[in-house]
């Protein structure tokens, strides 16, 4: 903290300008009026203050707004935002997307900092849901943003927002997250025709149930192996050899290279070897001829 000292004669700041970088910390404390600072925050970012000096300015704002800064100040914080703690940010009420963008811009091109994570959390909570414009903005700055949310948080994403999601935004999502996102995507894209629908839904298929995969197998979609490998194992297991062949189309040959990996490995174990042989890929490990297949999960459900 800077000691309270009187401002030297002639040094009282009439406006926030470049001359202030030549002020010592105690002079900034004594000579810069907090209300003036608040109304001219947009100028601070254009002045190369040291963070030591910015600490003094932050302290002045903290004293002026002990309950948290108003949005008119927040929007123009610029590099001073990088001096804010998550505790500071939790006091804010940020409702404007422009404010959010302005602060994300300061942190652009880098990992999400604790400050940014807190800011986004405050913003989304204030809005009540992740609307399309917000999601558009957040995924533009942080492609992995969606996958950083818990399944509970994802449940607040309206289906209309799914249109903003790009395939790369889902790269780090786990099955639990895709379980939540897939039904929303299905709803969002339901009015599209076959091939267009598949292009859009493809990234979300890690959350698709068996019946939807069966339906897709009837539509000549030619799913690539990378997508197939991300499908839920429990959704793939009930598919027949014929259904997988239709689902993958020409990509079915890729099964051989993946036969030791899930879900292909587990799926092979559930198929009759005779059926696997019809693919002509040399897949081994299926159920030998003459063996009876008991579906124990069905038996448990009945008992």
């Amino acid at each position: 903290e800077v000691e309270k000292t009187a401002c030297p004669s002639g040094k009282k700041a009439r406006e926030i300008d470049e001359s202030l970088i030549f002020y010592k910390k105690w002079e900034l404390e004594a000579c810069v009026d907090a209300a003036l600072l608040a109304t001219q925050m947009d100028r601070v970012n254009a002045i190369p203050f040291t963070y030591e000096q910015l600490d003094v300015l932050k302290h002045k704002l903290d004293e002026l707004y002990p309950q948290g800064y108003p949005e008119s100040v927040i929007q123009h914080l610029g590099y001073l935002f990088l001096k804010m703690s998550p505790e500071d940010i939790r006091k804010w009420n940020v409702t404007s997307l422009e404010t959010l963008k302005a602060l994300l811009e300061v942190n652009k091109g880098h990992e999400m900092s604790p400050q940014v994570a807190t800011l986004i959390d405050r913003f989304v909570k204030g809005r009540g849901q992740l609307d399309k414009d917000t999601l558009d903005t957040l995924t533009a700055f942080y492609p992995g943003y969606l996958c950083s949310l818990s399944p509970e948080e994802l449940s607040s994403v309206p289906p209309s927002s799914i249109w903003a999601v790009r395939p790369q935004d889902l790269d780090t999502c786990d099955p639990r997250q895709l379980d939540v996102l897939y039904p929303k995507a299905r709803l969002a894209f339901q009015n599209m025709n076959g091939s267009e629908y598949f292009v859009k839904i493809q990234s979300f298929l890690g959350g698709a149930p068996t019946e939807d995969l069966k339906a897709l197998s009837q539509q000549n979609v030619s799913m690539d192996l990378a997508t197939f490998m991300k499908l839920r194992t429990d959704a793939v297991l009930p598919l027949t050899v014929a259904e997988v062949q239709k689902l993958l189309g020409p990509h079915v040959e890729g099964l051989k290279a993946e036969e030791r990996h899930r879900p292909v490995r587990d799926w092979i174990l559930r198929q009759r070897q005779d059926d696997l042989d019809t693919l002509g890929l040399g897949l081994q490990g299926g159920i030998p001829n003459g063996y009876l297949v008991l579906d124990l999960s069905m038996q448990e459900a009945l008992s």
């Epitope: 190369p48 203050f49 963070y51 590099y79 990088l82 942190n107 880098h110 900092s113 604790p114 400050q115």
Partner: nanobody
């Protein structure tokens, strides 16, 4: 993060020197840059500064004689000093207003200083 200055030395009045400051390190970005100086028995004071947008600011005592510049590709800041005077004698420090992504906060980065003697 390290800022390393070079280019200081002994020069006659009216002479010129060019100071360089090379930034190295990972997980940080630089916003504003500046040169400060500290004469014997004095406090460190800003001489020239440059904002992230490229605007420059100079202390009255060096206006028209000193020029600050920045090469982003080389991560280097320069201070061209012409028409040097004995009162320019000081240790010159490179400064960067940066952001450390490991720490998660804005930080002040300083070089170790390079000595300039005009006599």
């Amino acid at each position: 993060v390290q800022l390393v200055e070079s280019g200081g030395g002994l020069v006659q009045p009216g002479g010129s020197l060019r100071l360089s400051c090379a930034a190295s390190g990972s997980m940080f970005s630089i916003n504003a840059v500046a040169w400060y100086r500290q004469a014997p028995g004095e406090q460190r004071e800003p001489v020239a500064a440059m904002t992230s947008g490229g605007s420059t600011i100079y202390a009255d005592s060096v206006k028209g004689r000193f020029t600050i510049s920045r090469d982003n590709a080389k991560n280097t800041v320069y201070l061209q000093m012409n028409s040097l005077k004995p009162e320019d004698t000081a240790v010159y420090y490179c400064y960067a207003q940066g952001y450390d992504y490991d720490e998660g906060y804005g930080m002040d980065y300083w070089g170790q200083g390079t000595s300039v003697t005009v006599s």
